[in-house]
């Protein structure tokens, strides 16, 4: 009887995945002196070991522990920027505000950003044809478990004032099912984190509503308050101007509300 490979609902492993991970590792360690000690071949071997030969619906956080160990990195715990559904602006911000960090500014986040990967049970092959979809197939897939693992660790490391950028154009500005809502919020440590400050990014040019009063933001405030962490919220009415003012804070137009 012929053996057919499981057909998953999601896209397959990103083209040139092994080469991309290795190249990104080399580039990152060249740019960040504090990570120059990292052996990128070992990082790739640990990454591969987390999912190769394993059923792609049966991946655990333990599978990624060797990779987590190799990618251990200290970022200033009071300079962490979380984000939900607004990755591009968050990354543009940390590219300008170089002393703040998103998860994708760390080695492990940088390696995996925008990539998809999975293997097959009992073979050494990477599956380039299809990978499990979180909703349609299973949640314990290699990509979802990776991001859950690194996101949890990133949130656990945060201290003092933690910022989160939220997308004010979405129906759920705060979504309990997002990585931020389901993982990061619940792994901020109340004994270390004083305040979570949300930046709600407006989409429309003429949108002058106070989105900090949105019911989902109130829900976030309630969750955070129950965890004995203070909550504050700011509207960013003009994200373009916001970025411009981060670049040039002395600009006279930057004293007004953005």
């Amino acid at each position: 009887v012929p053996r057919w490979r499981q057909q998953w609902s999601g896209p397959g492993t990103t083209k040139r995945f092994p080469e991309t991970v290795l190249a990104r590792c080399v580039k990152y360690t060249e740019i960040h002196p504090e990570m120059r000690h990292v052996d990128c071949q070992s990082v790739w071997d640990a990454f591969k070991g987390a999912f190769i030969s394993k059923h792609p619906c049966n991946i655990t956080e333990e599978d990624y522990q060797p990779l987590m160990k190799l990618g251990t990195q200290t970022v200033p715990c009071n300079k962490i920027l979380l984000w939900s559904r607004i990755k591009d602006l968050a990354h543009q911000f940390t590219q300008v505000q170089r002393d703040m960090f998103t998860l994708e500014d760390t080695l492990l986040g940088y390696l995996a950003d925008d990539l998809t990967w999975c293997g097959e049970f009992n073979t050494s092959k990477i599956n380039y044809q299809s990978c499990p979809d979180w909703r349609k197939d299973c949640s314990n897939n290699p990509v979802s478990v990776f991001w859950k693992t690194v996101s949890r660790r990133f949130a656990e490391a945060a201290c003092d004032v933690v910022h989160v950028m939220l997308n004010g154009s979405r129906s759920k500005i705060f979504d309990k099912n997002s990585t931020f809502g389901s993982v990061e919020v619940h792994n901020l440590q109340p004994e270390k984190v004083q305040t979570l400050e949300a930046w709600v990014i407006h989409g429309g040019r003429e949108d002058s509503r106070d989105l900090c009063q949105d019911p989902t933001i109130k829900e976030l405030e309630s969750i955070i308050s129950k965890r004995n962490i203070q909550f504050s919220c700011k509207n960013i009415y003009r994200p373009d101007k916001f970025l411009q003012c981060v670049k040039n804070p002395e600009d006279s137009s930057c004293t007004s509300e953005i």
Epitope: P2, R3, W4, R5, Q6, Q7, S9, G10, P11, G12, K15, R16, F17, P18, E19, S124, K125, I126, Y128, Q129, S130
Partner: antibody, heavy 122, light 110 residues
């Protein structure tokens, strides 16, 4: 039973565009698992994979490096078919052209069209 | 990468023949190998997929294997029959999922 039926001209002039169509029966071009490929075969180059189109929430195309600047593979959902367009042809493009299905559960081609001999000549 | 096959092989009916396919770069075991049979004036037919799997309808005289030490795949046909006379092509891919065929081996059943 899946079948692929090819059609298109057998003679194309140099610098013009080669156009072939492959009609699918027994499967859907919009299938979430299959991919629809074009391959050619000539004495000088043997079997050569040219490109594919496939649907996974949206349409995707992959093309061989050797032809990527000249090739378009398009699905036509209304007619359940897909097509090959190869621009700026030269006599080196003379070959038998095949359409074929990759079923998605292995890295191969399980159903092939009958092949179309295309000659590039003035 | 390239897949290299011998141009031709020949063997007598009832015997066993093995056709090798050597990968020039990249590890053969990291990517599945398929084998196709093509008789004159016909389209290719898949006889082995995923290194060693036989589609239904293909006789168990056909088998596929991988040898990591030589970075090659092989198609073995036992109990040769005259109807096995054809060209055989290996096919694999790389991390771009672009597909490559071997040059083909003409099998003559003497």
């Amino acid at each position: 039973q899946v079948q692929l039926q090819q059609s298109g001209p057998g003679l194309v002039k140099p610098s013009q565009t080669l156009s072939l169509t492959c009609v699918i029966s027994g499967d859907s071009v919009s299938s979430n698992s299959a991919a629809w490929n074009w391959i050619r075969q000539s004495p000088s180059r043997g079997l050569e994979w040219l490109g594919r189109t496939y649907y996974r929430s949206k349409w995707h195309n992959d093309y061989a490096v050797s032809v990527e600047s000249r090739i378009i593979v398009n699905p036509d959902t209304s007619k359940n078919q897909f097509s090959l367009q190869l621009n700026s042809v030269t006599p080196e493009d003379t070959a038998v052209y095949y359409c074929a299905r990759d079923p998605g559960y292995f890295y191969g081609l399980d159903v092939w069209g009958q092949g179309t001999m295309v000659t590039v000549s003035s | 990468f390239m897949l290299t096959q011998p141009h031709s092989v020949s063997e007598s009916p009832g015997k066993t023949v093995t056709i090798p396919c050597t990968r020039s770069s990249g590890t053969i075991a990291d990517y599945y190998v398929q084998w196709y049979q093509q008789r004159p004036d016909s389209s290719p037919i898949i006889v082995i997929y995923d290194d060693n799997q036989r589609p239904s309808g293909v006789p168990d005289r056909f088998s596929g294997s991988i040898d990591s030490s030589s970075n090659s795949a092989s198609l073995t046909i036992s109990g040769l029959k005259t109807e096995d006379e054809a060209a055989y092509y290996c096919q694999s891919y790389d991390s771009t999922n672009h597909w490559v065929f071997g040059g083909g081996t003409k099998l003559t059943v003497l």
